[in-house]
């Protein structure tokens, strides 16, 4: 689909650079080729990310921001393109790269996992919640004993360094806690996390990772779960979890366990009440959990189950014998 053309000669962009502008973020910049003769035509550019993950897209402007991990290095190419008579003319590629940072791969952290959680905020008079961040990791298998790790996160334009670490028996940081962050729990930006390290004996390879908020946000359980039995109707009610999401943004699951026969009933719903027809001879334990619905965000994690609520008769009446 790319045709050479003897009338139009497309020249590659010049001064193509890759600049790290933040944690897991680069800015690609280039200039139109000064020798390009066809200045009045609508030239575009095709950007190709070669590593760490292949991607390509087109743009009319001469810069492009990329959110990407950088511990494996980064490589990209750009070329001039022109749509002409249902065909695409293209120049040769201009390329640039960032080398992977120094350090043996075995020295970087492994199994980096992070979760966000919404908690009550005593300091804010308008938004009563705040978003905390908790990350854990394992020490690299080849990391010297004196290795110390340091964690940073970036969300949007904010980068913060961890101030509260948990340590292993050798005093090495293996977890981090941010009680307050700049993370928007309803936002769509990637959360970037970097763990770098230092040692007197060798270079410690940094490790960065991107997290989608919906995949790591630990939703709180529903609040104030109540259950009562009236005749053969078990009526259960609850309130939405502590969350920045409004009341219409939750799906719920109700779990009703019949203590007498072990029967487990799980029902999914979008309202904060449920009525079940039951056998009034039994004792039941009831739990509810919540998840942000796909109407408001991409599907994510279910909360933990709420603490069990016990209702019904305690005594074990024998089943009627015929």
């Amino acid at each position: 689909d790319l045709l050479p053309d003897d009338k139009i000669s497309l020249l590659p962009p010049v001064n193509f650079t890759i600049k790290v502008t933040g944690l897991a973020q680069v800015l690609l910049r280039w200039e139109p080729n000064p020798d390009q003769e066809q200045r009045n035509v609508n030239l575009e550019y095709q950007v190709k990310i070669n590593a760490p993950k292949e991607d390509d897209y087109e743009t009319r402007i001469t810069e492009s921001k990329c959110v990407t991990i950088l511990h494996k290095g980064f490589s990209a190419s750009v070329r001039t393109i022109l749509q002409k008579d249902h065909s695409l003319l293209a120049s040769s590629w201009a390329s640039a790269e960032l080398h992977a940072p120094p350090g043996s791969p075995g020295t970087s952290v492994v199994n980096l996992t992070c979760t966000t959680n919404t908690t009550a905020d005593n300091y804010s008079y308008l938004r009563p919640y705040q978003v905390s961040l908790h990350c854990t990791w394992l020490v690299g298998t080849d990391a010297p004993e004196d290795t110390q790790y340091f964690l940073y996160y970036r969300y949007g334009s904010w980068t913060e360094e961890c101030q509260e670490y948990s340590k292993d028996s050798m005093g090495r940081n293996i977890a981090c806690w941010f009680p307050r962050t700049f993370i928007h729990s309803r936002g769509r930006d990637w959360l970037a996390v970097l763990v770098n390290g230092s040692s007197k004996h060798s270079a410690i390879k940094p490790f960065d990772q991107l997290f989608a908020l919906h995949a790591i946000d630990q939703i709180n359980p529903p609040l104030n779960v109540t259950a009562e039995i009236k005749g053969t109707r078990l009526s259960i009610q609850w309130e939405k979890p502590v969350s920045a999401f409004p009341i219409h943004c939750f799906d719920y699951e109700v779990k009703i366990h019949n203590a007498r026969n072990g029967y487990l009933q799980i029902e999914k719903m979008m309202t904060n009440a449920f009525i079940s027809i039951i056998d009034d001879l039994s004792k039941y334990d009831v739990q509810v959990r919540a998840a942000v619905s796909s109407m408001c965000r991409e599907a994510g994690l279910w909360s933990e189950w709420s603490q069990p609520i016990y209702v019904g008769k305690d005594e074990h009446k024998p089943l009627r014998q015929w």
């Epitope: 905020d121 300091y123 308008l126 938004r127 949007g156 904010w158 928007h184 729990s185 769509r188």
Partner: antibody
Framework: QVQLQESGGGLVQPGGSLRLSCAAS????????MSWVRQAPGKGLEWVSA????????NYADSVKGRFTISRDNAKNTLYLQMNSLRAEDTAVYYC??????????????WGQGTMVTVSS | QAGLTQPPSVSAAPGQRVTISCSGS?????????VHWYQQVPGTAPKLLIF???NRPSGVPDRFSGSKSGTSASLAITGLQAEDEADYYC????????????FGGGTKLTVLR
């Protein structure tokens, strides 16, 4: 209640420097991110800079990046804005405001009365 | 230039209803980011009027309300009063800007006498 009082504004020549201060009271200053917002005469609001509660992370608008430095002294409940290489277009009323993020788009819930900075020869 | 667009001025008589629009793009309001509104009476500092699209801080009358749809937001004022004469600014978050904070250009509301 929350009170923010700016000071340090005045007349300065292009290329000169000025340091603005904002004294905070009525709230636990060290728990809040803070910000500067400016307003040129007869114009709209423009966010300038922000700093996190601990003072270790900062953010700037492109128009002031490399020239202005935001800082804070939590022991003194004071926010600062060091303005260097001042230009005529920096002429504005500078407001100190809290920078409330919590879980969403930052908003400015409390504002000082502002201090006027005039850059002119 | 990325930003939020507001009409420079609107006017209405006391008791009437007025709306002020705030038009954005896919990099700000269109991405679902919250919109806040400020009121600035001439000669005074701005005051937060609406936060998170449609929430009022305590002390703000319920005559003021906010809404959002697609890439635009609106501030509505019902039962207009003389003291509502002021400049109104919308503000949001823009992923294409370095600091991400973006204001609208402001709208001057005149209450006709």
């Amino acid at each position: 209640q929350v009170q923010l009082q700016e000071s340090g504004g005045g007349l300065v020549q292009p290329g000169g420097s000025l340091r603005l201060s904002c004294a905070a009271s009525g709230f636990t200053f060290s728990n809040y991110a803070m910000s500067w917002v400016r307003q040129a005469p007869g114009k709209g609001l423009e966010w300038v800079s922000a700093i996190n509660s601990g003072g270790k992370s900062t953010n700037y608008a492109d128009s002031v990046k490399g020239r202005f430095t935001i800082s804070r002294d939590n022991a003194k409940n004071t926010l600062y804005l060091q303005m260097n290489s001042l230009r005529a277009e920096d002429t504005a009323v500078y407001y100190c405001a809290d920078y409330a993020t919590n879980y969403g788009v930052p908003y400015f819930g409390s504002w000082g009365q502002g201090t006027m900075v005039t850059v002119s020869s | 230039q990325a930003g939020l667009t507001q009409p420079p001025s609107v006017s209405a008589a006391p008791g009437q209803r007025v709306t002020i629009s705030c038009s954005g793009s896919r990099s700000n309001i269109g991405s679902g980011y919250d919109v806040h509104w400020y009121q600035q009476v001439p000669g005074t500092a701005p005051k937060l009027l609406i936060f998170d699209d449609n929430n009022r801080p305590s002390g703000v009358p319920d005559r003021f309300s906010g809404s959002k749809s697609g890439t635009s937001a609106s501030l509505a004022i019902t039962g207009l009063q003389a003291e509502d004469e002021a400049d109104y600014y919308c503000q949001s978050y823009d992923s294409s800007l370095s600091g991400h904070v973006v204001f609208g250009g402001g709208t001057k509301l005149t209450v006709l006498r």
